[in-house]
């Protein structure tokens, strides 16, 4: 029986800059039950504070909802494990709102095909910002990635789309069945995981030529 | 309207306990740190104790220390004092204040009336 | 403990006049944390400031506040007719603490 091996807290994810969540890895248990805390303060405090939600995130996580989510303001974290037998303590963490956004993915993906009679066919591909994400506010730029591909395809073809929620695709194999995902991320930040996929039935009469 | 009001003021022999009481309105009270403040008869503004929104750790004041116990329930927008052991010094107007964050240690938006407290022989 | 000294202990001025009130701290103190108040007589105090230069909601803008450190202050910019009352100015990086105020009376 020993005391507890060293936590590490190894991922912080905010939504939306308006709550986060950090999560730890426990260290060795020493072979007796362990309790662990989270405590933390932000930059230039003289107090710390407990974990105020360890239930939202899940197992060995600490959840900070709005009340406790500030912008330009460095959290510095740290978790202790205790047992009968001692404690130990992670590294201190330190966190910035700012830099850990990972938006929801985007919603509402849309995939057309259009046949002008003027012009080339495209493939037309529309979306909405994530729910939780309040661009008007200007806090936030969502940038936008695209991708695509071939029902039986290995490889995807990947668009940078900028701030855009719209895109048109001109190159694409008639008579294939394709998939399109679209995800986001911020100006700082993680891109989300990609969008549930799209598929799409492109014509035998979409032509590529001119 | 945002407001809180306190209750439970009165005048104590020295030795002696009150409970205060302050309920809030016109706002989430669960999403805000509280606190007591009190002021002397013609004196200044001293904080007694506070904790944050979720009922965490209490913290207060040296010259209250193992005399006070604050208490919240948030599910009735509740902030309670419990004040054991008074001393004259202890005599105040008592306001129950509001955090403008989940934190008690941030800067107070919001102020009750205040509830008189009198420690005399 | 941070201990908060405020000068001057009275400020007597005219209504439309200027007013700059010090605040100083026994150790340094990150500027998210620094908030004034002002209190009528007879009345609770009112946040003004917060965050060293943050207007609360409702403030005007002849209210500002500056300073880093060690060393920070309130202006007003033209005193009005209820601003003459006590200043308090206030702490929050480590267990809140307030300074002993200035009161600001009618020249």
């Known amino acids: 029986q020993l005391p507890p091996g060293k936590p590490e807290i190894f991922k912080c994810r905010s939504p939306n800059k308006e709550t986060f969540t950090c999560w730890w890895r426990p260290g060795t248990d020493g072979g007796l039950p362990t309790n662990y805390s989270l405590t933390y303060h932000r930059e230039g405090e003289t107090l710390m504070h407990e974990c105020p939600d360890y239930i939202t995130g899940g197992p060995n996580s600490c959840h900070f909802g709005k009340q406790y989510t500030s912008m330009w303001r460095t959290y510095i974290m740290m978790v202790n494990a205790t047992n009968q037998m001692g404690s130990s303590f992670s590294d201190e963490l330190y966190v910035d709102v700012t830099y850990i956004v990972q938006p929801d993915p985007p919603l509402e993906l849309a995939v057309e095909v259009k046949q002008p009679e003027d012009r080339k066919p495209y493939l037309w591909i529309k979306w909405s910002p994530p729910t939780l994400i309040d661009l008007k506010t200007g806090w936030f730029t969502l940038l936008y990635e695209i991708r695509l591909k071939p029902e039986k395809a290995a490889e995807w073809e990947i668009h940078f789309a900028g701030q855009q929620t719209e895109f048109k695709i001109l190159s694409l194999h008639p008579g294939q069945k394709y998939l399109v995902q679209v995800r986001c991320k911020p100006d700082h930040g993680y891109w989300s995981a990609w969008s549930p996929a799209t598929f799409i039935q492109i014509p035998s009469d979409f032509t590529m030529n001119d | 309207e945002v407001q809180l009001v306190e209750s439970g003021g009165g005048v104590v022999r020295p030795g002696g306990s009150l409970r205060l009481s302050c309920v809030g309105s016109?706002?989430?009270?669960?999403?805000?740190?509280m606190n007591w403040v009190r002021q002397g008869p013609g004196k200044g503004l001293e904080w007694v104790s506070g904790?944050?929104?979720?009922?965490?750790?209490?913290n207060y004041a040296e010259s209250v220390k193992g005399r006070f116990t604050i208490s919240r329930d948030n599910a009735r927008n509740s902030l309670f004092l419990q004040m054991n052991s008074l001393r004259a010094e202890d005599t105040a107007l008592y306001y129950c204040?509001?955090?403008?964050?989940?934190?008690?240690?941030?800067?107070?938006?919001?102020w009750g009336p205040g509830t008189m407290v009198t420690v005399s022989s | 403990e941070i201990v908060l000294t405020q000068s001057p202990g009275t400020l007597s001025l005219s209504p439309g006049e200027r007013a700059t009130l010090s605040c100083r701290a026994s150790?340094?103190?990150?500027?998210?944390?620094l908030a004034w108040y002002r209190q009528k007589p007879g009345q609770t105090p009112r946040l003004l400031i917060y965050?060293?230069?943050s207007r609360a909601t409702g403030i005007p803008d002849r209210f500002s506040g500056s300073g880093s450190g060690t060393d920070f202050s309130l202006t007003i910019s033209r005193l009005e007719p209820e601003d003459f009352a006590v200043f308090y100015c206030?702490?929050?990086?480590?267990?809140?603490?307030f300074g002993p105020g200035t009161k600001v009376d009618i020249k």
């Open positions: 204040v509001r955090g403008r964050s989940g934190w008690f240690n941030d800067a107070f938006d919001v």
């Open positions: 016109g706002f989430s009270f669960d999403d805000h740190g």
């Open positions: 904790f944050n929104w979720n009922g965490g750790s209490t």
């Open positions: 150790q340094t103190i990150n500027s998210n944390y």
């Open positions: 965050g060293t230069s």
């Open positions: 206030q702490q929050y990086a480590g267990l809140p603490t």
